[in-house]
């Protein structure tokens, strides 16, 4: 089948090869599209409601005055010339619509180095097929999930027109000491080939470098974090900054389901409490700062360890904030 692409709303003429240039003609068009349930047969005689969608011209060609999404599909013509020789034409029709120029909305004027920031949301309206949005930094493509880049995408389809609206939200973590005025742009690449990408106007947010904070100290009691089963460990997060930041706790890299507190008590330690703990200090004026991680382990009876924790307690085998 010959591939034909046609712009939505434009006329389309499909030639019926081998058909005599004018009547009488022995030819038949068969269509299988979004408008048909199976194959629809159209003859030169025409007539009826289909004429407004597709009709056979005097030269045997099929004429569609304004193609739509429902006209995507297969078009076949079978014609017999004056000598009785049969010729078949076979077309695969795909339609497209170029959207308006994409735009960046909700764009940030300032980004903070070292922490994730929302740069903006790229919006493209009125495409078919959907196509894709991609982001560029200083003219080079940005790859999601690499070097602190993340992209959230959403595709919506208009219930009446069937055209697509694409949205792409860009989050980046600018490197400390990097470009103070990076240039971001977004481009729409059509779903059908042979159409050039459409690019937004660029945006140039400023990158703000936070003043390095004094380090967050994590103090473990007993030192070394090794304790006998049933023992107690106290973790204290010390942050020199004023006012005191909010302190959250992580275990094995996952935030614990707790309200903020500078102290984490691990009483009645059991096997499930072993792991790596750290605290995260969140300042209102800076990004989050994570402490070093400490490993909490259980010394089985008879083992030599750096220290042993206190034994005894309530029997409420648990770990919590104090």
């Amino acid at each position: 089948a010959q591939n034909i692409t046609a712009r939505i709303g434009e006329p389309l003429v499909l030639k019926c090869k081998g058909a005599p240039k004018k009547p009488p003609q022995r030819l038949e068009w068969k269509l299988n599209t979004g408008r048909t349930e199976a194959w629809k047969v159209l003859s030169p005689q025409g007539g009826g409601p289909w004429d407004s969608v597709a009709r056979v011209l005097p030269n045997g060609s099929l004429f569609l005055p304004a193609v739509g999404i429902q006209d995507e599909g297969i078009f076949r013509c079978q014609a017999m010339n004056r000598n009785g020789k049969e010729t078949k034409s076979n077309y695969r029709v795909r339609v497209y619509q170029i959207p308006g120029k994409p735009e960046i909305v909700d764009s940030a004027s300032e980004l903070t180095a070292g922490v994730p920031n929302k740069v903006g949301t790229c919006v493209s309206e009125g495409s078919y097929p959907a196509g894709t949005l991609s982001w560029h930094l200083d003219g080079k493509p940005l790859v999601p999930n690499e070097k602190g880049v993340s992209v959230k995408e959403q595709t919506r389809r208009h219930p009446e027109t069937g055209l697509f609206t694409l949205q792409s939200e860009l989050m980046v973590t600018p490197a400390r000491g990097g470009d103070p005025r990076p240039t971001f742009s977004c481009s729409f690449s059509p779903g059908l080939p042979r159409h050039r990408a459409l690019r937004t106007a660029p945006i140039q947010p400023r990158v703000w470098e936070p003043v390095p904070l004094e380090e967050v100290q994590l103090v473990v009691e007993p030192e070394g974090g090794a304790v006998a089963p049933g023992g107690t460990v106290t973790l204290t997060c010390e942050v020199p900054a004023q006012p005191s930041p909010q302190i959250h706790w992580m275990k094995d890299g996952v935030p614990l389901p707790l309200p903020p507190s500078p102290v984490l008590i691990l009483p009645e330690i059991g096997p499930q409490d072993q792991g790596t703990y750290s605290c995260v200090a969140t300042h209102s004026s800076h990004g989050p700062q994570e402490s070093r991680a400490v490993s909490i382990s259980i010394i089985e009876p008879g083992e030599e360890g750096p220290t042993a924790g206190s034994v005894g307690g309530s029997g409420l085998g648990t770990l919590a904030l104090a």
């Epitope: 996952v254 102290v263 691990l266 307690g313 409420l316 919590a320």
Partner: antibody, heavy 118, light 109 residues
Framework: QVQLQQSGAELVRPGTSVKVSCKAS????????IEWVKQRPGQGLEWIGV????????NYSERFKGKATLTADKSSSTAYMQLSSLTSDDSAVYFC???????????WGQGTSVTVSS | QAVVTQESALTTSPGETVTLTCRSS?????????ANWVQEKPDHLFTGLIR???NRAPGVPARFSGSLIGDKAALTITGAQTEDEAIYFC?????????FGGGTKLTVL
């Protein structure tokens, strides 16, 4: 053994407040958190919030911000939940539970029934 | 707010193995949701069974176990007993709050 003893049933007028208590025993009160949960008749459970009795730090469900206030008194090993501007929607049984660092709601109080009626 | 979905009711026989599940409307349940399972018996008698996805609470029989199966949290009772007839609630943590499921009424016939 661990016990959470809640205050008795309350019948209160719309627009007023009520304070429910939860006395902990059998463990070191400041080592564990106390959470509060709402259960309406024939319905499921709804999380209200959690308090760290050691530091006073709290987390509230969005729905209960401004409705519930959680406090704790270390000297009596008692946690409190105050509900304000009561309406019939606040009629329910309220539970406290001891709250583990990994969210383990191991031990529960017996529940306090609050009925809001004029 | 996220919605947590459980089977409304399940029936099993003594000695059988039964699995209750807990689905999140926001996507796959992970260890950072700290899946929690709580048992309710008549007269508002609540007991914590599983915390942190797969850790049994103190004194809970070994026949109760927690896990992640596919994109859901699961509570498995291996060799159910008549006293296990109860309502089971799961709860999932979402950054700064818990959301409970609607509960599964387990009948042991």
């Amino acid at each position: 053994q661990v016990q959470l003893q809640q205050s008795g049933a309350e019948l209160v007028r719309p627009g007023t407040s009520v304070k429910v208590s939860c006395k902990a025993s059998g463990y070191a009160f400041t080592n564990y958190l106390i959470e509060w949960v709402k259960q309406r008749p024939g319905q499921g459970l709804e999380w209200i919030g959690v308090i760290n009795p050691g530091s006073g730090g709290t987390n509230y469900s969005e729905r209960f911000k401004g409705k519930a206030t959680l406090t704790a008194d270390k000297s009596s090993s008692t946690a409190y939940m105050q509900l304000s501007s009561l309406t019939s929607d606040d009629s329910a049984v309220y539970f406290c539970a001891s709250y583990r660092y990994d969210g383990g709601m191991d031990y529960w109080g017996q529940g306090t029934s609050v009925t809001v009626s004029s | 707010q996220a919605v947590v979905t459980q089977e409304s009711a399940l029936t099993t026989s003594p000695g059988e193995t039964v699995t209750l599940t807990c689905r999140s409307s926001t996507g796959a349940v992970t260890t950072s949701n700290y899946a929690n399972w709580v048992q309710e018996k008549p007269d508002h008698l609540f007991t914590g069974l599983i915390r942190g996805t797969n850790n049994r609470a103190p004194g809970v029989p070994a026949r109760f176990s927690g896990s992640l199966i596919g994109d859901k949290a699961a509570l498995t009772i291996t060799g159910a007993q008549t006293e296990d007839e109860a309502i089971y609630f799961c709860a999932l943590w979402y950054s700064n709050h818990w959301v409970f499921g609607g509960g599964t009424k387990l009948t042991v016939l």
